[in-house]
């Protein structure tokens, strides 16, 4: 009798642990990646940013992978994605090639199965940064809720990468899982 | 036998309640604080904004504390932090001291244990607000995912506080807990 | 005895399923709606945007309803709301009526019970888009955490709708439920 009861209890505990594992013990994936300023490309054309920190300062990652400049999804789900990109220029760092700038960010998703890239979010502004002004600054923020599958990759493209603000509080992107796919 | 079964069940229920308490019954902390326009500092220099509403209109707080102009974390966890800051000027309110402005926001974290302040997020823009234009407006939005410990404090610093838009839909910041720390 | 044990287990399972249903099986509501460019109003005045996709490309909806240009809440809760609005103009598409623009977004909540509309979030900028420049672009992002009741409706108002960028990665808004109301 007692043995049978324990078996029943194990079944209940099994169900409970299954839920617990899914909803609590298997931690929800997240990442907050900050720009690695030692390797920012030069130029004014649109480029993919491949150097990000994932384990220093505010940067962190869990149940996702950072590889080859891309944030890789390890767990299917609906995620909130965000990016904050700051551009700046001070006259002491040199001249601007042009005073008319297109300062843009593109958050893209790449599927390995179907090797194609799609833009999930974009933001930015055209700016007139006069050569007569000592300092210029501009920030872009984008965010949105997206279905991501395991193996898909998130990357960041920007125009005018040489103007990026290298501070960890300025130029970063991230994701956190909000819920499972039904 | 029946008593033994109830004891077994109580153990199962205890485990279940423990999960439920952690994941549901212990409500996840959040805050959405809106600017208190009756006490906005003047001037153009960078200042910490200390007057915010937490219990009127859209403003609300739960399982966090608002004290001395700072949002205090009561529960360890990973939080999504955000801020929306609007600046505006109408010629009927007087002249601008300068037409060249740096309109910025800094979301900072202070630890009481180690009394130091660190900027988590920043955003903004340099702007030319010509005296020939009747009205000027500009908004900044920042957001990011951060590990916060109980006792840590979140505060907002801005430049040109006298230009802040005092509406509750314009100038606000907030946080909500997404998950526990492993 | 065995029958009694099963009844006890059913009670435990009932409690467990109740939690599971609330926290996992009853999927958390969300929506990500992208602009329907086939029906963007013209003009420069402030208008409510009523045409959005909810089931193509990045657009999706679950446990919320999209009707008559409004996102309808079906489940009480605290939601994170966001919007990203992009404006653009290329000289090949004609002249601007004025070079001085107010590019704004307003995220509004309407209660059917009390037929009144309130702005939850606003953002934007005054811009000078010179006729001498070939291309202009500007994006706004807003986000915040709000208590929403079943039956309440979320809508988007913008100024200068004719300048909206019709791409799905550019102009969108959304919501996801974070937690229940205590």
């Amino acid at each position: 009798g007692s043995q049978h009861i324990r078996a029943e209890k194990a079944m209940v505990d099994g169900s409970w642990l299954d839920l617990a594992k899914r909803s609590k013990l298997e931690a929800q994936p997240f990442a907050h990646l900050t720009i690695n300023a030692t390797d920012i490309p030069s130029g004014s054309h649109k480029v993919s940013l491949s150097s990000w920190y994932h384990d220093r300062g505010w940067a962190k990652i869990s149940n996702m992978t950072f590889s080859n400049g891309k944030l890789i999804v390890n767990q299917d789900g609906f995620y909130y994605l965000y990016a904050n990109i700051c551009f700046r220029h001070h006259e002491t760092s040199g001249d601007l090639a042009t005073e008319y700038l297109q300062l843009m960010v593109y958050v893209t998703k790449t599927s390995i199965k179907i090797p194609s890239s799609h833009t999930l979010m974009k933001g930015g502004s055209t700016k007139y940064w006069s050569g007569n002004s000592e300092f210029h600054f501009y920030s872009i923020n984008v965010g949105g809720f997206f279905k991501l599958r395991s193996g898909e990759e998130i990357s960041i493209e920007v125009s005018n990468p040489s103007l990026l603000d290298p501070d960890q509080d300025a130029t970063y992107f991230g994701a956190f899982k909000v819920r499972d796919i039904d | 036998g029946s008593q033994h079964i109830r004891a077994e069940k109580a153990m199962v229920d205890g485990s279940w309640l423990d999960l439920a308490k952690r994941s549901k019954l212990e409500a996840q902390p959040f805050a959405h604080l809106t600017i208190n326009a009756t006490d906005i500092p003047s001037g153009s220099h960078k200042v910490s904004l200390s007057s915010w509403y937490h219990d009127r209109g859209w403003a609300k707080i739960s399982n966090m504390t608002f004290s001395n102009g700072k949002l205090i974390v009561n529960q360890d966890g990973f939080y999504y932090l955000y801020a929306n800051i609007c600046f505006r000027h109408h010629e009927t309110s007087g002249d601008l001291a300068t037409e060249y402005l740096q309109l910025m926001v800094y979301v900072t974290k202070t630890s009481i244990k180690i009394p130091s302040s660190h900027t988590l997020m920043k955003g903004g823009s340099t702007k030319y607000w010509s005296g020939n234009s009747e009205f000027h407006f500009y908004s900044i939005n920042v957001g990011g995912f951060f590990k916060l410990r109980s006792g840590e404090e979140i505060s907002i610093e801005v430049s040109n506080p006298s230009l802040l838009d005092p509406d509750q839909d314009a100038t606000y910041f907030g946080a909500f807990k997404v998950r526990d720390i492993d | 005895g065995s029958q009694h044990i099963r009844a006890e287990k059913a009670m435990v399972d009932g409690s467990w399923l109740d939690l599971a249903k609330r926290s996992k099986l009853e999927a958390q509501p969300f929506a990500h709606l992208t602009i329907n460019a086939t029906d963007i109003p013209s003009g420069s005045h402030k208008v409510s945007l009523s045409s959005w996709y909810h089931d193509r490309g990045w657009a999706k909806i679950s446990n919320m309803t999209f009707s008559n240009g409004k996102l309808i809440v079906n489940q009480d809760g605290f939601y994170y709301l966001y919007a990203n609005i992009c404006f653009r103009h290329h000289e090949t598409s004609g002249d601007l009526a004025t070079e001085y623009l107010q590019l704004m977004v307003y995220v509004t909540k309407t209660s059917i019970k009390i037929p009144s509309s309130h702005t939850l979030m606003k953002g934007g900028s005054t811009k000078y888009w010179s006729g001498n420049s070939e291309f202009h672009f500007y994006s706004i992002n807003v986000g915040g955490f709000f208590k929403l009741r079943s039956g309440e409706e979320i809508s988007i108002e913008v100024s200068n709708p004719s300048l909206l960028d019709p791409d799905q990665d550019a102009t969108y808004f959304g919501a996801f439920k974070v937690r229940d109301i205590d």
């Epitope: 130029g43 004014s44 760092s93 040199g94 090639a97 006069s130 007569n132 000592e134 | 300068t98 030319y128 | -």
Partner: antibody
């Protein structure tokens, strides 16, 4: 330290062209406009134009627009200024120059004397 | 083009005395809260040397007896106590807008 070293003196026939060089060192060549200024004998200084070496953006004063071409070779950090259809009044010292870290022309080449004579 | 007119064209100052050179622009050279006027010294056979940038800022290594003032269209270079080595031609220059332009120069002679 920032250095601008120019090519040697030139004696050229009227109607011909001249191409002067300016080798830069001590700074990132692709992040500053490199300017060309000339000084005719006994006369003042005259700004001719400039190049931003990275993308090769140029700007010229109207007076020289049709006759001057400024180029740059980023691999050697060298800028060039070619002046066509030379006249006797083009006889001058030609300087390449760069602004300081704030403003004003803080760095000058040693100058190249160009003499236009038959 | 912005025309810069310097005066006087030449001046003679005794050692230890003050020298003042004026530069007038045909239109304002101010923008973004700054005056884009600079002063140079040139000695025979040499390239010009930057003395003052942005109307009133002393370039590194330049003696403190040199100073600049002014805004919008009227600017002044002052040498508080002239020394023998100050004999040279002085030019003003604006770079507020293209094309950048120079004044005609002022030749300083030491008595």
């Amino acid at each position: 330290q920032v250095q601008l070293v120019q090519s040697g003196a030139e004696l050229v026939q009227p109607g011909a062209s001249v191409k002067l060089s300016c080798k830069a060192s001590g700074y990132t060549f692709t992040t500053y406009w490199l300017q060309w200024v000339r000084q005719t004998p006994g006369q003042g200084l005259e700004w001719m134009g400039a190049i931003y070496p990275g993308p090769g953006n140029t700007k010229y004063t109207q007076k020289f627009k049709d006759r001057v071409t400024i180029t740059a070779d980023t691999s050697t950090s060298t800028a060039y200024m070619q002046l066509n259809s030379l006249r006797s009044e083009d006889s001058a010292v030609y300087y390449c120059a760069r602004r300081g870290s704030r403003r004003g022309i803080a760095y000058w080449g040693q100058g190249t004397l160009v003499t236009v004579s038959a | 083009n912005i025309v810069l007119t310097q005066s006087p064209a030449s001046l003679s100052v005794s050692l230890g005395q003050r020298a003042t050179i004026s530069c007038r622009a045909s239109e304002s050279v101010d923008s973004y809260g700054r005056s884009f006027m600079h002063w140079y010294q040139q000695k025979p056979g040499q390239a010009p040397k930057l003395l003052i940038y942005l109307a009133s800022n002393l370039e590194s290594g330049v003696p403190s007896r040199f100073s600049g003032s002014g805004s919008r269209t009227d600017f002044t270079l002052t040498i508080s106590r002239v020394e023998a080595e100050d004999a040279a031609t002085y030019y003003c220059q604006q770079d507020n807008e293209d094309p950048y332009t120079f004044g005609g120069g002022t030749k300083l002679e030491i008595k």
